[in-house]
Interface confidence: low
């Protein structure tokens, strides 16, 4: 999936299986990613688990779990708030669109989480105070906390190289991270479809083009569109909402530039 | 050198602010200081020359004498919470306000700095 980190870096990751997205003193978010096509390096999120840890007089431990075709509007125990404690309403789930869009507000840690199902796969977005982001027991064990550190270099897809290949008129099939680029989606069509929803040619737009060329699944256009919309709602600095490509500092990493 | 871990555990254990515990919190504060001292001793070998480490060691001694804490006595279990930030709050942990981050944050300083993370597509 595409990852926008807390530090506004933008990466395309091929991480497969279960990975920690957030892991701090207050909550733990884990995603499970699966290949979008058999044999493909590109993966998308098929399962999401959020654990809100027990916290003082506010909330009991609560688990939220979403999977493909199952986006619940309640925690695993059936409740919609933080339990029986005095401040239980400082954690709430709201269903925005049945089966498609859920918002979780954790006021006790100043955090808002948006989970969506777009097509077959899930998207995740969070707004969180810096102080909560950095509230970790052991900074040494933070290595694989994706939202903070990004994904490991060997798990990144070289977005720019892929795009350069895609733009050239006769691109070899091997240039794509997926074994077969669906013939139904020539580069020009992918560009046109993404332009429709994402008029600014930023990294969300580039991600959209990448996804259409990789999978041929038009739902990924909506995934990129909603990711940007959620960013509009959740990012505190509107000037940094659109991220643009710049010269890479590391191979495979697409860094942010406001 | 795990001094930052010791520091964050100390902050967690002293939600009423490390420099001015409420008078009824002093035994708990002293217990937190002893735990902090123990943590720094455990990490001492790997912290030679680390400024934060030495700063912490001296500060513990200073704070213990300021609050008349005995070197021996019970230690504390660190609480999970590291918020609100160390300051002059006398807020008790069972206050409903603690369940509203922004309200408890505004008591201490300017609005919190928010960050955003997102995951989507393939």
């Amino acid at each position: 999936p595409h990852l926008r980190t807390f530090t506004d870096h933008f990466q395309t990751c091929k991480v497969q299986g279960a990975w920690p997205l957030i892991d701090n003193n207050y909550l733990n978010v884990q995603v499970t990613n699966t290949p979008v096509l058999p044999g493909s390096a590109a993966t998308a999120t098929s399962k999401l688990t959020i654990i809100f840890k027990n916290f003082q007089e506010c909330v009991d431990q609560k688990v939220y779990q979403a999977e493909m075709d199952e986006l619940p509007s309640a925690f695993a125990d059936g409740s919609k708030n933080g339990g029986d404690k005095h401040g239980a309403n400082s954690l709430k789930i709201t269903e925005k669109v049945s089966g498609q869009h859920v918002e979780i507000q954790a006021k006790y840690i100043g955090t808002t989480i948006v989970v969506r199902q777009v097509g077959r796969y899930l998207t995740f977005a969070v707004r969180m105070p810096e102080e909560v982001v950095n509230a970790v027991e052991d900074r040494d064990s933070q290595g694989l906390y994706l939202c903070l550190r990004g994904c490991p270099l060997n798990q990144q897809i070289d977005f720019q190289a892929f795009r350069a290949n895609a733009e050239s008129p006769r691109r070899p099939a091997a240039a794509s991270p997926s074994p077969v680029v669906p013939e139904t989606f020539p580069y020009e069509t992918a560009v046109a479809k993404c332009k429709e929803k994402l008029p600014v040619e930023d990294l969300y737009y580039q991600a959209c083009v990448f996804d259409l060329l990789t999978t041929g699944d038009v739902n990924f256009t909506l995934a990129a569109y909603y990711a940007l919309e959620d960013g509009k709602m959740l990012h505190s600095n509107k000037d940094k909402l659109h991220l643009f490509e710049r010269t890479r500092e590391l191979p495979g990493a697409v860094a942010a530039a406001a | 050198c795990k001094i930052l871990k010791c520091n964050s555990e100390f902050w967690s254990a002293t939600s009423s602010g490390s420099h001015a515990p409420a008078s009824d919190d002093v035994p708990e504060f002293c217990a937190a200081l002893r735990t902090y001292a123990l943590c720094t001793r455990r990490t001492a070998r790997t912290c030679r020359g680390d400024l934060a480490y030495h700063s912490a060691v001296h500060g513990i001694e200073d704070l213990m004498s300021q609050h008349n804490c005995s070197k021996d006595g019970p230690t504390s279990q660190p609480r999970v919470r590291t918020l609100p930030p160390a300051g002059d709050s006398q807020e008790r942990s069972d206050s409903p306000e603690i369940c509203h981050y922004e309200k408890s944050f505004h008591k201490h300083s300017a609005a919190p700095n928010y960050t955003h993370c997102g995951l989507f597509g393939d």
Partner: antibody
């Protein structure tokens, strides 16, 4: 009142050494580190190193390693910074500063500064 | 060349807000909880204005505030006053090194 009082201005020849003192009062000397920071004329602040009066531990900026020596005398609550093999670019105001205690790191009290001029 | 980059100068009229940025690396700023800011008037010693990124020592007016995003720390002075005209330095403790920014001259127009 917490105070750091430094020794007076010095004029030195290239190749010589200078020793600046910093007398602390109003707090427990061994409870705080002492940092040394210098500022060349019209330039920014430049961290030189740090000493713990409690343990004698020092931590020097890499570029000054071998030329700088920091010491303390706990009986008089005084910190010293000695810089050897002086060159013209060492001309600066030298400040001592108290390091905040506990799990905090900042320089909360500063001396008035000592001007050291290196000139042939 | 300083390891922490600050703008050379910023200016504003009385009552306005100004923000000074301090950009470093992930180890010097991004991962550091030890970012402090100092004010220095000409011919005077520096004065601590903020520590631990956002905390204000007693005696520092609340118009001074700090924040951090990624590898950039910022000092904001809201409601600028004539006495705020000075040089401002960011400082970060990273590992065993203490780094200062090159300094920013704040001018009150």
């Amino acid at each position: 009142e917490v105070q750091l009082v430094q020794s007076g201005a010095e004029v030195k020849k290239p190749g010589a050494s200078v020793k600046v003192s910093c007398k602390a009062s109003g707090y427990t000397f061994t409870s705080h580190g002492i940092s040394w920071v210098r500022q060349a004329p019209g330039q920014g602040l430049d961290w030189m190193g740090w000493i713990s009066p409690y343990s004698g531990n020092t931590n020097y900026a890499q570029k000054l390693q071998g030329r700088v020596t920091m010491t303390t005398d706990t009986s008089t609550s005084t910190a010293y910074m000695e810089l050897s093999s002086l060159r013209s670019e060492d001309t600066a105001v030298y400040y001592c500063a108290r390091v905040g205690s506990g799990p905090y790191y900042y320089m909360d009290v500063w001396g008035q500064g000592t001007l050291v001029t290196v000139s042939s | 060349q300083s390891a922490l980059t600050q703008p050379r100068s910023v200016s504003g009229s009385p009552g306005q807000s100004v923000t000074i940025s301090c950009t470093g690396t992930s180890s010097s700023v991004g991962d550091s909880i030890y970012v402090s800011w100092y004010q220095q008037h000409p011919g005077k010693a520096p004065k601590l204005m903020l520590y631990d990124v956002t905390k204000r020592p007693s005696g520092v007016p609340d118009r001074f505030s700090g924040s951090k995003s990624g590898n950039t720390a910022s000092l904001t002075i809201s409601g600028l006053q004539a006495e705020d005209e000075a040089d401002y330095y960011c400082c970060s403790y990273a590992g065993t090194d203490t780094l200062f920014g090159g300094g920013t001259k704040v001018t009150v127009l």
